[in-house]
């Protein structure tokens, strides 16, 4: 199968990063570099821009069968890959002539999974083995979230006004998750 998968300790089945579909061409309505408006330079405050498209995640979808060893789901599933820039790149030259780049300290905006959907799938196995049920967690939506360097890694902040709104039907997550576990989840996300 083209979509190999591995299991992590949360028993999610996550496609290999190398198998993600190619993102579509970059959006062409980036106004921050418009010479008439900004003299060809980015504005002083990179996050004070009216162009909402700069802050949106791209939600690319893909289709796959869930596999577990030789077993494969009876029905395929579809989920999202979170992609795209959350705000201007804010990359500055590190040193003259070095050609290296660095990101200034401050809020780091990432396009990561926002909402998951738990889905029960039936796995069919070869050799007359009985089918077995399995629950998988599929990415259902993406969001730009702010990762503040000065706070614990696990403190991901929602970007935009939606942060204040509690989500319906969702229990508050225990805060005691280790930063290490959370970092692994972030790395899986993009």
């Amino acid at each position: 199968q083209g979509w190999q998968a591995f299991k992590n300790d949360a028993t999610e089945i996550i496609p290999e990063l190398g198998e993600y579909p190619e993102p579509p061409p970059e959006l062409e309505n980036n106004k921050t570099m418009n010479r008439a408006e900004n003299g060809g330079r980015p504005p002083h405050h990179p996050f004070e821009t009216k162009d909402v498209s700069e802050y949106s995640c791209r939600e690319l979808h893909f289709t796959r069968y869930v596999t577990d060893g030789p077993c494969r789901s009876a029905k395929p599933v579809t989920e999202l890959v979170c992609s795209g820039q959350c705000g201007p790149a804010r990359l500055l030259p590190n040193a003259i002539g070095r050609g290296k780049w660095w990101r200034p300290s401050g809020p780091d905006f990432r396009c990561i999974p926002d909402r998951y959907r738990a889905q029960r799938v039936q796995l069919l196995c070869p050799g007359g083995e009985a089918p077995r049920a399995r629950k998988v967690r599929l990415v259902a939506s993406c969001k730009c979230k702010r990762l503040t360097r000065f706070h614990n890694q696990s403190e991901l902040k929602d970007f935009g006004t939606e942060a204040a709104r509690p989500q319906k039907g969702r229990k508050p997550r225990p805060r005691a998750r280790s930063a290490k576990a959370n970092q692994a989840e972030l790395e899986n996300a993009y």
């Epitope: 579509p24 939600e59 690319l60 979808h61 289709t63 789901s73 029905k75 395929p76 599933v77 579809t78 989920e79 999202l80 909402r115 998951y116 959907r117 889905q119 799938v121 599929l138 990415v139 259902a140 939506s141």
Partner: nanobody, 118 residues
Amino acid sequence: EVQLVESGGGLVQAGGSLRLSCAASGRTFSRDVMGWFRQAPGKVREEVGSIKWSDANTYYADSVKGRFTISRDNAKNTMYLQMNSLKPEDTGVYYCAAAIIGGTYNDWGQGTQVTVSS
């Protein structure tokens, strides 16, 4: 439930083209994504590609990239599969299916036969 009906299958020579259609009716608002799948004789059903209805973002399996194109017509509630440079290994029954994002493809059409002769 979404009702799906495929059409456009047939016999074609290797290197030829074919265009399949999948017309959706019923609770079409309950689907985010529509996909094409195929099943060759004696093989398991495999994904061909899919399209996200809201923004027409497409996904293709490696085996068909560059040869097959998926599109949709909102007004007609129809998805298309344009198949070019067909190969004998593209032979099989082609199915269309619908799903919500983060879920399984629960609604399926009856399928249309595509045969590519060498």
